[in-house]
Interface confidence: low
């Protein structure tokens, strides 16, 4: 299709080499063209829409994105050629920064419903460059946290080193929706609620003698509770003894609740104690089984292929730790009475003999 009729917008992404950040292009189709697609969404301030410029998000997601090669080759379909760029409804999301993202991006409706739609397209000329090292050290992060129930602010990373007085007029979007209540380089939140979480975009215009560009930055904001003051607690195992059958496989599950921490480095291990020896066991990876705003429940299992007589003399210890402290829960195995026949016991003794040799040769013991 002929892109000469597309409206054009120039954007600059000055990315920080110190941190991961994303970038977003909106398919901001032109206002005057009141075709099926070229309508801005009219939403009340209480609503949280998914994306920017279309009337009914149920009928809408169908815009097509292309990249225009600099050598004049035909337009490339973004989805096929650029796996780090994700088309999400009416936005184009760049997952990784880099100058190789520099180029022209075109969006238009997928379904052309009328002759007017042919020219309903936007060409975005994106220039991507690393931020100069001369930039201030304290520039705002592209990931910002707001503490629920308190006051907070969201800063535009590309302007955070400038005072409010010097700052140019800023346009803010949240989850693709224009935020009209502020033009400052900082959004001040009087009381943080969960709905303040989302993807914020801040734009300002930078002009030189030749042309003007929109400088854009993307901020991922999450709303959090305060860091826990408690060490993790073990929810399972509850009992300190467990009835087992010799010669049968056994899985012991350790589940622990970790309170929220902004910097979260949970530790969950299984140890075996045997007389005065103690060693950490290689077990499957821990997995998160429930995650809420204030805590996370993590599970890690220890798997015994077959329970042996030796296992009955051992203590199995689940150890969990966060930045506050650690908690342990010990489990002693107890043979179920009248469970196994002579064959089971004979098998278990054979296994135990092999296992003794294996532990002596392979396990690193520490006291």
């Amino acid at each position: 299709f002929n892109i000469s009729g597309c409206s054009t917008k120039k954007l600059l992404w000055a990315y920080s080499t110190r941190s991961e950040e994303e970038f977003i292009l909106f398919c901001d189709l032109p206002e005057p063209q009141k075709s099926h697609f070229c309508h801005r969404s009219q939403l009340s301030p209480t609503q949280v829409p998914d994306h920017l410029p279309f009337t009914d998000s149920k009928d809408l997601p169908d815009v097509q994105w292309y990249r225009q090669p600099s050598n004049g080759d035909p337009l490339e379909d973004i989805r096929k050629s650029y796996p780090h760029i994700i088309q999400d409804k009416c936005t184009l999301r760049f997952l990784t920064p880099g100058v190789n993202n520099t180029g022209s991006y075109i969006c238009r409706p997928k379904m052309i419903k009328s002759p007017y739609d042919v020219a309903c397209c936007v060409k975005m000329i994106l220039e991507v460059k690393p931020q100069s090292n001369a930039s201030c050290e304290n520039s705002a992060s592209h990931k910002q946290d707001l503490l629920l129930g308190s006051t907070g602010s969201i800063s535009c990373p590309s302007l955070s080193c400038q005072s409010d007085a010097q700052s140019p007029e800023v346009t803010w979007y949240k989850n693709g929706k224009l935020l009209s209540m502020t033009r400052s380089n900082r959004i001040v939140v009087d009381e943080v609620y969960i709905y303040h979480q989302g993807t914020y975009v801040c734009d300002y215009t930078q002009s030189d003698t030749a042309s003007s560009w929109t400088v854009r930055a993307v901020v991922q904001v999450r709303t959090i509770v305060g860091d826990t003051k408690l060490k993790p607690d073990i929810l399972d195992p509850v009992e300190s003894t467990l009835e087992v059958e010799l010669g049968k496989p056994l899985t012991i599950s350790c589940k622990a609740r970790f309170g929220f921490e902004r910097v979260f480095n949970p530790v969950m291990k299984w140890y075996i104690k045997d007389a005065d020896l103690e060693w950490e066991v290689s077990v499957p990876e821990a997995k998160s089984i429930k995650s809420t705003l204030k805590d996370e429940i993590i599970e890690r299992n220890i798997i015994l292929e077959k329970v042996t007589q030796r296992d009955l003399r051992r203590t199995f210890v689940c150890f969990v730790q966060n930045s506050i402290g650690n908690t342990t829960q010990s489990v002693q195995l107890k043979e179920k009475r009248g469970s196994g026949g002579l064959n089971d016991i004979f098998e278990a003794q054979k296994i135990e003999w092999h296992e003794t040799v294996r532990f002596q040769s392979h396990h690193h013991h520490h006291h």
């Epitope: 609503q47 998914d50 998000s57 429930k290």
Partner: antibody, heavy 123, light 107 residues
Framework: QVQLQESGPGLVKPSETLSLTCTVS????????WTWIRQPPGKGLEWIGY???????NYNPSLKSRVTISVDTSKNQFSLKLSSVTAADTAVYYC?????????????????WGQGTTVTVSS | AIQLTQSPSSLSASVGDRVTITCRAS??????LAWYQQKPGKAPKLLIY???NWESGVPSRFSGSGSGTDFTLTISSLQPEDFATYYC?????????FGQGTKVEIK
């Protein structure tokens, strides 16, 4: 296991103030939102409002002028006051806990409910 | 306020039947929808949150789907204990609102 128990008078006179308390047992009131919901006889559910452990509130606009929700963290209780009641306020009143589940984005869930208390407005 | 409309208002079904209840929102609510089950004289019980996630302990015969404005609760094989009233509820914007309910009765 967290349990909620509503308490308060079962009969309130028109134009008076309805007062209910919800006692949280088996868990802390901290880090959750605590809500009131009501259900008129034979009808559906209506959300009245919530209070957080820090005391911030949000009320249904249809009741906002008459509702006050408060919290007493030391007693593990939160309360509902509904002023100027009429027969239309006759309902079963439930208290519930709102938890926030993280799945990429946050989602509220009302996962623990009291058994409900019937309030009749009549002279 | 966002309005939720459930259909049907009531239905009769037999044990073992597959039952589908729909909930339509007056505007897009992403996936911020929960389903509850309520038995006479009891408080509602959470079944599904975020449109399709099971609350722990809820049998797998209950499933939820949908996004935007149209949502569905499906009971794959109705059991005697499933005869109750089912409500949908949106958590997208305040005030939280509920559907008017769907009563599932024994045929």
């Amino acid at each position: 296991q967290v349990q909620l128990q509503e308490s308060g008078p079962g009969l309130v006179k028109p134009s008076e103030t309805l007062s209910l308390t919800c006692t949280v047992s088996g868990g802390s009131i901290s880090n959750y939102y605590w809500t009131w919901i009501r259900q008129p006889p034979g009808k559906g559910l209506e959300w009245i409002g919530y209070i957080s452990d820090s005391g911030s509130t949000n009320y249904n606009p249809s009741l906002k002028s008459r509702v006050t929700i408060s919290v007493d963290t030391s007693k593990n209780q939160f309360s509902l006051k509904l002023s100027s009641v009429t027969a239309a306020d006759t309902a079963v009143y439930y208290c519930a806990r709102e938890t926030i589940v993280v799945r990429g984005f946050y989602f509220y869930v009302m996962d623990v409910w009291g058994q409900g208390t019937t309030v009749t407005v009549s002279s | 306020a966002i309005q939720l409309t459930q259909s049907p208002s009531s239905l009769s079904a037999s044990v073992g039947d597959r039952v589908t209840i729909t909930c339509r929102a007056s505007q897009g609510i992403s996936s911020a929808l929960a389903w509850y089950q309520q038995k006479p004289g009891k408080a509602p019980k959470l079944l599904i949150y975020d449109a399709s996630n099971w609350e722990s302990g809820v049998p797998s015969r209950f499933s939820g789907s949908g996004s935007g404005t149209d949502f569905t609760l499906t009971i794959s094989s109705l059991q005697p204990e499933d005869f109750a009233t089912y409500y949908c509820q949106q958590f997208n914007s305040y005030p939280w609102t509920f559907g008017q309910g769907t009563k599932v009765e024994i045929k």
